[in-house]
């Protein structure tokens, strides 16, 4: 299917930028892996880069405005062809539920006092307005809640008093638009405005005074420009060449807008100046090598040693890392592919342990399926033996850091009938649904 | 563990319709995310429907969007594939398949077999023109 096809990825809000154009390929448009691409107009927008995960969204607002709720975020697999890890396809979105809190409690009503007397009439002739009003106390709000209704109300009262009424003119109207739009034509220009005895009207009993002066003033139109010529378009000047030496480009041409130039005011040509067309080399553009996450530190041994497990030694470990996705001449990963470090090794080492204080609470879990719960942990964990933090191996080499390396057995003492984790688990409450952003706009 | 079993497949003309049910015992299918997939012979197998635990999103192949609903009745812990104006290429073997409650979701992992943990054994279904 065709896809559109843009030169650019913007990784911070995950938007295609610099459209090159439609009705190309997937597999055209990503020749060149900075390029990006979208299935539809407004559509999610992926970046022709091998898939890797996005950053995590920032946290939705809680689920509820006061006592406990949960709230989502999501991160979403970007890229094309191959998979996030996880084994996980492009446009896939993992999403973490947690705990919130916007307010401890939640807002409770209050009730109303009795209405206080009627206030005196806001007027000494003809009809007015008188206020009463109430207390929000009876009992009062608490959390920040409030009373239904209204603190005052009103009616209208009459004095039985006439009021005479003298007229007034309200502020004039503006100018109507002058007769003609530039000089030169057959009528003088002309604008008008005009104003209404209405601010207030005149009262006929008692009778008040009209107003003074003329409703409506004219004058003549200045500083008006010469009547305007539209501009119109030369021909299509050459198809510029295509500016790329691999996957996509754009190739251009230019008209001006001379035949004849808009003067004195007319209206610039209608339409575009460029005219752009892609361009494809149907070469594949260099792909960068990167460096895939380390592995997994090499046992801690020593040469010549069958074990150098729970003992004062300091050994030697490695873990190496993977190149991947170098492609059609792109550069080599930098740095090194082996990274080597000291270690004393505490595999399966019997040590004394003491619990740890309670985890924070982790995240709620599964964030997109029934009854989400999170917990918290004390671990029995290990106190390490007290050895030099720094060894020199070779002369002359200076002083090395030495890094406590495997999984030792802990032993403390039982708490709540258990030797190694206590575990407190909870219900996550008002669950949020799992909904794709995207779909949303749709 | 959970068992799919998968009825209603038959020999219709085209333009006819057809519902397709998937009855699950072991566990409750209202909490799972259910699909819908199909495969013709000497075919790779295709994506045709999914349904989100909550049923708050639902996603159709381009294919069957607009004759084809999907849908479930957590009282009979069964899902249905609703066929409507069946036409010969809908001619092929229908599997429904189930996804553990978990972190990820998206029309693009719902159309991906590898997603699914459960699945059944299949039903045919023929369209003759």
């Known amino acids: 299917d065709p896809v559109l096809c843009f030169t650019q990825y913007e990784e911070s809000s995950g938007k295609c930028k610099g459209l090159l154009g439609g009705g190309v390929s997937v597999e055209d448009c990503c020749l060149n892996t900075a390029f990006a691409y979208q299935k539809r107009s407004g559509g999610l927008c992926q970046p022709c880069r091998s898939p890797r995960w996005s950053l995590w969204s920032t946290w939705a607002p809680c689920s509820v405005t006061c006592s406990e709720g949960s709230q989502l975020r999501y991160r979403r697999c970007v890229g094309w062809n191959g998979q996030c890890s996880g084994k996980v396809a492009p446009g896939t979105l993992e999403w973490q539920l947690q705990a919130c809190e916007d307010q401890q409690c939640c807002p409770e009503m209050g009730g109303w006092s009795g209405w206080g007397p009627w206030e005196p009439c806001s007027v000494t002739c003809s009809k007015g307005t008188r206020t009463r009003r109430r207390a929000c106390n009876h009992p009062a709000p608490k959390c920040g809640g409030h009373c239904p209704g209204q603190a005052q109300e009103s009616e209208a009262c009459d004095t039985q008093q006439v009021c005479p009424t003298h007229g007034a003119w309200a502020t004039w109207g503006p100018w109507t638009p002058c007769s003609a739009s530039c000089h030169g034509g057959p009528h003088e220009p002309k604008e008008t405005r005009s104003r209404k005895c209405s601010a207030p009207e005149p009262s006929q009993k008692p009778p008040g005074k009209p107003c003074p002066g003329l409703a409506y003033e004219q004058r003549r139109c200045t500083g008006l420009p010469p009547c305007p010529v539209a501009g119109g378009w030369g021909p299509w000047g050459p198809v510029s060449p295509c500016p790329v030496t691999c996957g996509l480009g754009q190739t251009m041409e230019q008209r001006t807008c001379n035949h004849p130039v808009p003067q004195h005011g007319g209206p610039f040509c209608a339409g575009d100046a460029t005219r752009t067309h892609i361009c494809n080399t149907a070469v594949p553009c260099p792909v960068d090598g990167e460096w895939d996450s380390w592995g997994e530190w090499s046992p801690c041994i020593r040469r010549n040693m069958k074990s150098i497990s729970c003992q004062e030694i300091p050994g030697q470990q490695s873990r190496g890392r993977t190149c991947r996705g170098r492609k059609f001449d792109g550069h080599r990963c930098a740095g090194q592919q082996q990274d080597i470090r000291h270690c004393y090794s505490i595999q399966h080492c019997p040590l004394k342990g003491s619990w740890s204080e309670w985890s924070t609470w982790g995240l709620c879990m599964p964030p997109c399926g029934p009854n989400p719960t999170r917990a918290r942990q004390r671990l029995c964990t290990p106190l390490l033996p007290k050895y030099p933090p720094t060894v020199s191996m070779v002369e002359g080499q200076g002083e090395k850091n030495v890094t406590f390396w495997g999984r030792p057995l802990p032993r403390c003492e039982e708490l709540q009938g258990q030797k190694l984790v206590v575990e407190e688990k909870r219900p996550c409450l008002h669950v949020p649904a799992c909904k794709d952003p995207e779909e949303e706009e749709l | 563990q959970v068992r799919l079993v998968e009825s209603g497949g038959g020999l219709v003309q085209a333009g006819d319709s057809l519902r397709l049910s998937c009855a699950a015992s072991?566990?409750?299918?209202?909490?799972?995310?259910m699909g819908w997939f199909r495969q013709a012979p000497g075919k790779e197998r295709e994506f045709v429907a999914a349904?989100?635990?909550?049923?708050?999103?639902?996603y159709y192949a381009d294919s069957v969007k607009g004759r084809f609903t999907i849908s479930r009745d957590n009282a009979k812990n069964t899902v249905y594939l609703q066929m409507n104006s069946l036409k010969p290429e809908d001619t092929a073997a229908y599997y429904c398949?189930?996804?553990?409650?978990?972190?990820?979701?998206?029309?693009?992992?719902?159309?991906?077999?590898?997603?699914?943990?459960?699945w059944g054994q299949g039903t045919q279904v023929t369209v003759s023109s």
């Open positions: 398949a189930a996804e553990e409650p978990s972190k990820y979701s998206g029309r693009d992992y719902y159309m991906m077999g590898d997603s699914y943990d459960y």
């Open positions: 072991g566990r409750t299918l209202s909490s799972y995310a």
């Open positions: 349904t989100t635990w909550r049923d708050t999103s639902t």
